[in-house]
Amino acid sequence: DGNSTRSPETNGLLCGDPEENCAATTTQSKRKGHFSRCPKQYKHYCIKGRCRFVVAEQTPSCVCDEGYIGARCERVDLFY
């Protein structure tokens, strides 16, 4: 399923466009709970991966493509 990461923001920021002011703090998480597709406003949230929505927390989570890590799959995995 790839690497799963989650951002803790719950303020509804859209985090996909350049002008968006997203929360800076992020946390890694294992796949727990239930997921649905991320709302459309998060279309570009995951840089190199697929966005999933943590239903219980109403937060976006990224499943990174192979070779990428980070809360938004924004970093190349040097150990890959």
Epitope: F35, R37, C38, R50, F53, V55
Partner: antibody, heavy 119, light 106 residues
């Protein structure tokens, strides 16, 4: 090829029960969310229930407390247990595969099974 | 939940362009998908994520979504395109379908 095959439909009296089955083949069943969608005679499509690949369930308001969706990944089968059936539940019931998780779209459909609730 | 409204019927002459609308409050903020259903058959996905086309679906099918209206467009409509068409979106952890539009190719 990817295929969904429903069974279990039939004639049942109001207040009765029925269990629908949907046999999946041609893909890794356990990796997908699945849903049931129904269509009353001459009417449009109505989503009934969905079941995520990790067990999360969701229902349309009109069937909550009466219908239960479940799956057996070892048998590649999706189920819909329907209790306290009403005349308005009469419809063709389709099993559909959600692309990846909930919230995407239905990329594979079964041929449907007819449920008739009548005395 | 969001309510999706479609015209009950649309008529088009062969070779012409057919447009089927799906209206809903701020629907442009949601992904909209379109299904084709012919009599006695199961629905078939023809457009997903507003404007993407599954493999095997002819190029004459296209979609758009903005503001309060999503649109399915069939360019150079053929007789075989006569069917019911349904829009669909995901809202508040549930699936919502439009009421359907019967496309008649005159």
């Amino acid at each position: 090829q990817v295929q969904l095959l429903e069974s279990g439909g039939g004639l049942v009296q109001p207040g009765g029960s029925l269990r629908l089955s949907c046999a999946a083949s041609g893909f890794t069943f356990s990796s997908y969310a699945m849903s049931w969608v129904r269509q009353a005679p001459g009417k449009g499509l109505e989503w009934v229930s969905g079941l995520g690949h990790v067990g999360y369930t969701t229902y349309t308001d009109s069937v909550k407390g009466r219908f239960t969706i479940s799956r057996d990944n070892s048998k590649n089968t999706l189920y819909l247990q329907m209790n306290s059936l009403r005349a308005e539940d009469t419809a063709v019931y389709y099993c559909a595969r959600d692309y990846l998780d909930f919230g995407y779209y239905f990329d594979v459909w079964g041929q449907g099974t007819l449920v008739t609730v009548s005395s | 939940d969001i309510e999706l409204t479609q015209p009950p019927s649309v008529s088009v002459s062969p070779g012409q362009t057919a447009s089927i609308t799906c209206s809903g409050d701020k629907i442009g903020k949601k992904y909209v998908h379109w299904y084709q259903q012919k009599p006695g058959q199961a629905p078939v996905l023809v457009i997903y994520d507003d404007s993407d086309r599954p493999s095997g679906i002819p190029e004459r099918f296209s979609g758009s979504n903005s503001g309060n209206t999503a649109t399915l467009t069939i360019s150079g409509t053929q007789a075989e395109d006569e069917a019911d068409y349904y829009c669909q979106a995901w809202d508040m952890q549930s699936v919502v379908f439009g009421g359907g539009t019967k496309l008649t190719v005159l």
